[in-house]
Interface confidence: low
């Protein structure tokens, strides 16, 4: 069969076929998995050697499944995420490696997400995968492969299913911080033109909390039409994307054309279960303003979070909506070998 | 208790704009999405716009795009929403309501809007000439 | 956006009687990942804000009476008044958050004793 019939043909079978047939729909899964790899393959059976006296970058790439299937009514993915994605930055900035969650249920809006997953766009074919956090390194060997396992570790204590650990207690004490409950001032930080200035900095520790810095001056309200983007966090320096709206939700003022990305990016909040909007890059900067105007395009959301590691590090690895770095747009890095699933750790629970 | 107050009623004259405002005491603002719906006469409730004020954007109701404009204040923790353009058949009640902190996506907090615990007492507003 | 039709407008229901209120979507509110229907009910009285009974399809709100439930999945829900009160004379409204822009309600049911 001809090989770029056969990839589409399969997932319109998957896609048809009754969730009851578990293991053809498992068969199914593997092939397509083995069909969509197969490039990947090639090539690392080309990079058979590590070259550790040059020390060079390599990537390395690893996805590890988020246990829904066993745990469905344990948000996972809000866990990972933390207040404004605080938990997923610093796991990254802590790790050394790129995060993102991926898959089915990746997306906030569920009948965009489904949507976009049967218009059989490769960008958008890993929404037909099991919900995953990809982990992404580049660097040189023995780092790289530090990195990883240390991002391996740290994320399988995000996986466990438990409503009180201490991930969440440090999660509560930071959100109890940041809605001002903590402080008499209710500061917010200063909003203006999308961007919010709130004192804040990079804990070593865990994904949890940070220790409560002084409280900013007290919120003012922006005027009226500024508040398309949402406000940024300036945590680290080399932080990325600048988010977009959700492209139904038009300016406040009819005409208003959102303002271009900071020439110093930053760190936009995200919420648990990130409501709106991915974000700007060059590429797509145009496309997002364009969509003010048209009302007819939406953003896909999903949970991608850049962190501080160099300029260069990184090729986007998502689609134009959600790129994290400046670099241009390319396809998704083809997996290494080892990038399959890595089943959830906690068999027990 | 945690509480939503609305702004008083209010009448208008066709083509002005009125501004109404929803005021949230004693819980949390700044992560959850707060909607306004309408209720006009005789009609069903009716979906007009939302805000999540940490994030400052707002999506709208298509119909109402051109001509409302729902803005957020977190150091009052209040939300305004203004109706521009005003006709006879604005004339109704305007509720704002606040996303639910019961088992909010499994005991994780989602900034998104979901289903809605906690309303304003409502605000009418007259439109007539 | 996903439509949602409520049946019937209004129904009649002697005391102690059950009410039954359906609501269908025009696509499923079914989330594959985590089994939840994205549906609420409120009951609306005049004069007063709208109120919350049911979230997830099937949870009843705390402090809602039991005769409240709500069931269905997919596209099509019910809310059903078991031995209706006369304090639960109403329009009951059902409420897809699946997409939530827009979000979208039924057109409502008037439930009135007979």
């Known amino acids: 069969m001809e090989e770029e019939k056969y990839l589409p043909e399969l997932m319109a079978e998957k896609d048809s076929l009754d969730p009851s047939f578990v293991h053809a729909s498992r068969l199914l899964a593997e092939e397509i998995e083995k069909f969509q790899g197969s490039d990947g393959k090639k090539e690392d059976e080309e990079k058979k050697y590590l070259d550790v006296i040059s020390n060079k970058n390599i990537k390395l790439s690893e996805r590890v499944l988020i246990p829904v299937k066993q745990y469905p009514k344990f948000n996972f993915v809000g866990k990972l995420l933390g207040p404004r994605g605080n938990s997923l930055k610093r796991l990254q900035e802590e790790t050394g490696a790129k995060m993102s969650i991926l898959g089915k249920g990746s997306m906030r809006d569920k009948a965009k997400e489904e949507e976009l997953r049967k218009s059989g766009e490769a960008k958008y074919a890993h929404l037909s995968d099991e919900l995953h956090v990809l982990i992404e390194v580049f660097a040189p060997p023995g780092e790289a492969y530090s990195r990883m396992s240390h991002a391996l570790e740290e994320i399988k204590k995000f996986l466990v299913p438990d409503y009180n650990d201490e991930i969440r207690q440090e999660q509560l004490r930071e959100l109890s911080y940041l809605n001002g409950s903590e402080d008499s001032g209710r500061g917010r930080g200063i909003r203006g033109r999308g961007i919010r200035i709130a004192p804040t900095a990079p804990s070593r520790g865990r994904g949890g909390a940070i220790p409560p810095p002084p409280p900013p001056g007290r919120g003012v309200l922006t005027p009226r039409g500024s508040t398309v983007t949402r406000g940024a966090l300036p945590v680290p320096p080399v932080a990325r994307g600048v988010p977009t709206p959700r492209a139904r939700g038009a300016p406040t003022v009819p005409g208003y054309r959102a303002p271009p990305p900071p020439a110093h990016e930053a760190y936009e909040e995200y919420g648990y279960d990130d409501g709106y909007g991915g974000e700007y890059d060059d590429q797509t900067y145009e496309t997002y303003d364009n969509s003010y105007a048209t009302q007819t395009q939406s953003v896909p959301e999903y949970y991608d979070y850049g962190h501080g590691v160099s300029e260069d590090a990184y090729d986007s690895y998502a689609p134009e909506e959600w790129a994290t770095t400046r670099s241009s747009l390319k396809a998704p890095p083809q997996r290494s070998a080892r990038g399959g699933y890595r089943e959830h750790p906690y068999g027990r629970y | 208790p945690v509480h939503l107050v609305q702004s008083g009623a209010e009448v208008k004259k066709p083509g002005s704009s009125v501004k109404v405002s929803c005021k949230l005491s004693?819980?949390?603002?700044?992560?959850?999405?707060i909607i306004w719906v309408r209720q006009a006469p005789g009609q069903g409730l009716e979906w007009m716009g939302t805000?999540?004020?940490?994030?400052?954007?707002?999506n709208y109701a298509e119909k109402f795009q051109d001509r409302v404009a729902i803005v957020a204040d977190e150091a009052t923790s209040t939300v305004y929403m203004e109706v521009n353009s005003l006709r006879s058949e604005d004339t109704a009640i305007y509720f704002c309501a606040r996303d639910s902190e019961v088992e909010k996506s499994d005991g994780y907090m989602a900034s998104t809007a979901e289903y809605f615990q906690l309303w304003g007492q409502g605000t009418l507003v007259t439109v007539s000439s | 956006d996903i439509v949602m039709t409520q049946s019937p407008d209004s129904l009649a229901v002697s005391l102690g009687e059950r009410a039954t209120i359906n609501c269908k979507s025009s696509q499923t509110v079914l989330h594959s990942s985590n089994n939840r229907n994205y549906l609420a009910w409120y009951q609306h009285k005049p004069g007063q804000p709208p109120k919350l009974l049911i979230y997830?399809?099937?949870t009843r709100e705390s402090g809602v009476p039991d005769r409240f439930s709500g069931s269905g999945s997919g596209t099509d829900f019910t809310l059903t008044i078991n031995s209706l009160q006369a304090e639960d004379v109403a329009v009951y409204y059902c409420?897809?958050?699946?997409?939530?822009?827009?979000?979208?309600f039924g057109g409502g049911t008037k439930v009135e004793i007979k």
């Open positions: 004693g819980g949390i603002f700044s992560y959850f999405a």
């Open positions: 409420q897809q958050y699946y997409d939530t822009a827009p979000l979208t």
């Open positions: 997830w399809a099937s």
């Open positions: 805000i999540i004020p940490i994030f400052g954007t707002s």
